[in-house]
């Protein structure tokens, strides 16, 4: 059940600059946000920044600037030292803690083929002379048409022609960038999230947060749901995502039903209430 989203972007203007965006999807009061790289905080990761709603922020190189974007999301600008571009293959994790109920953490990384400022690089298209293309195209259509008619006639000898159903292509699936689950753990998870649940709840924000938080950034509104989001399940969005439990961070399995108020971005379509306790790691 994702409650934390993570998005890593390469800045279009400076190729050595990266920004990590993280947000908490839920009404709980955030008491601390920790951003780490190389793995989760407290589990092999190295702290990059700590943001406290009242006490301010602390950051460590290569973090350049950590700031709150809304009451439930933060961004962290990073300066890549250059040469080997270590950020490209690095996992960034964000942990949102709500005391004493618990902490929710999720990890993400830059998509392997990220062009600055783009969701995915454009696919090169081979150039073909217009006249040749026209001839080839027409020939192809005629050949295909004849072949198809012959095929239909042959089938009609044996049985009535079946009604052809239009193929419902999901345009969203064609244009969207895939959102993938976080880096798989090398450890034997509770037996590594063996099954993948690709169900999605309607990603709608139909009411404000109970505690009046600022509304979520738009790119938080489309997320994989649950332990879950399949690596091949596409959702329209920019940048790279990455949360499947916070899951805080979860193995696939039955999801609670869709019963909650307002925020319907979770696998259970309700998100944690102000005090859903889960995992209080700080």
């Amino acid at each position: 059940t994702p409650e934390v989203w993570v998005q890593v972007q390469m800045e279009a203007t400076e190729l050595s600059s990266f920004t990590v965006h993280c947000g908490f999807l839920g009404p709980g009061s955030i008491s601390l946000v920790t951003v780490s790289w190389g793995g989760p905080d407290g589990a092999g990761g190295t702290k990059l920044a700590v943001l406290h709603p009242e006490l301010g922020t602390r950051q460590w190189a290569p973090a350049r600037q950590a700031r709150w974007e809304t009451q439930s999301s933060i961004s962290l600008a990073l300066e890549d030292s250059g040469a080997s571009s270590p950020f490209a293959n690095t996992t960034f994790c964000c942990k949102f803690a709500s005391f004493p109920e618990g902490s929710w953490e999720s990890c993400g990384s830059l998509p392997p083929s990220s062009d600055p400022g783009l969701s995915a690089p454009p696919t090169p298209v081979p150039i073909l002379r217009a006249d040749l293309a026209g001839i080839l195209g027409l020939s192809g259509v005629l050949l295909f048409g004849c072949g198809y008619l012959l095929h239909l006639l042959r089938r009609q000898k044996h049985r009535p022609t079946p009604r052809l159903q239009p193929s419902h292509t999901n345009s969203q699936a064609l244009t969207a960038q895939a959102w993938a689950p976080s880096q798989a753990s090398q450890a034997a998870l509770h037996d590594p999230y063996a099954t993948i649940n690709t169900s999605f709840c309607p990603a709608t924000l139909d009411t404000a947060h109970p505690n009046g938080w600022a509304s979520l950034p738009t790119h938080a509104a489309h997320q994989p749901q649950g332990p879950a989001a399949s690596a091949s399940t596409p959702i329209l969005a920019r940048g790279s995502f990455v949360s499947v439990e916070n899951g805080l961070y979860t193995q696939a399995g039955e999801r609670p039903p869709h019963t909650g108020p307002g925020l319907t971005l979770f696998p259970d379509c309700r998100g944690p209430r102000a005090v859903e306790g889960r995992f209080g790691v700080r």
Partner: antibody
């Protein structure tokens, strides 16, 4: 290896106080909250409270407010729980546990101390 | 506080048998967590967030439920599963545990 080592059994008089410890090893102490649970002989589990090991913030079960006091000593990576004005109802095993976190695609594990047995009798 | 009632309080099952333990909450909760405890040992997180197995828990265990009704199921009972199981809610303070279900092997 993560370990939570609790102090030994206590036999105390009614009305007295007792302070038990929970020494953490194998991880960064301040990265995880610590919570305490009571279990009376042959009975179920009761959440006493949670302490934020980093900023020492506490949250108590109302039932144990005034009875239990949670503290930590970061320098020795130790959490403490003091129980005051003891009665026979306080005779139980008390566990400290490292609160768990869920992180996408990482294993979820919790760690508990072995428990401290407290017997209150005259 | 939110009282969690587990049933049955005690049950025994034969090896290979399917076992279901239920936990009923006095008021609705978002998720239920389950702990396993064997005599003389500390409890262990067994299932978290209703349906997710903690590290090292055999796949024959599963959890489900919503609202006020949750359950833990063992598809095929094994001797090592004999223990007491507790449900826990962390949706409202104070966090509460169920009274426990003692599962024995026949």
């Amino acid at each position: 290896e993560v370990q939570l080592q609790e102090s030994g059994a206590e036999h105390v008089m009614p009305g007295a106080s007792v302070k038990m410890s929970c020494k953490a090893a194998g991880y960064t102490f301040t990265d995880y909250w610590m919570y305490w649970v009571k279990q009376r002989p042959g009975q179920g589990l009761e959440w006493i409270g949670t302490i934020d090991t980093s900023d020492h913030k506490t949250s108590y079960n109302q039932k144990f407010r005034g009875k239990a006091t949670l503290t930590v000593d970061e320098s020795s990576s130790t959490a403490y729980m003091q129980l005051s004005s003891l009665t026979s109802e306080d005779s139980a095993v008390y566990y400290c546990a490292r609160d768990f976190i869920i992180t996408v695609n990482y294993p979820v594990v919790d760690y508990w101390g072995q428990g401290t047995s407290v017997t209150v009798s005259s | 506080q939110n009282v969690l009632t587990q049933s049955p309080a005690i049950m025994s099952a034969s090896p290979g048998e399917k076992v279901t333990i239920t936990c009923s909450a006095g008021s609705s909760v978002n998720y239920m967590h389950w702990f396993q405890q064997k005599p003389g040992t500390s409890p262990k997180l067994w299932i978290y967030s209703t349906s997710n197995l903690a590290s090292g828990v055999p796949a024959r265990f599963s959890g489900s439920g919503s609202g006020t009704s949750y359950s833990l199921t063992i598809s095929r009972m094994e001797a090592e599963d004999a223990a007491t199981y507790y449900c826990q809610q962390r949706s409202s303070l104070p966090f509460t545990f169920g009274s426990g279900t003692k599962l024995e092997i026949k």
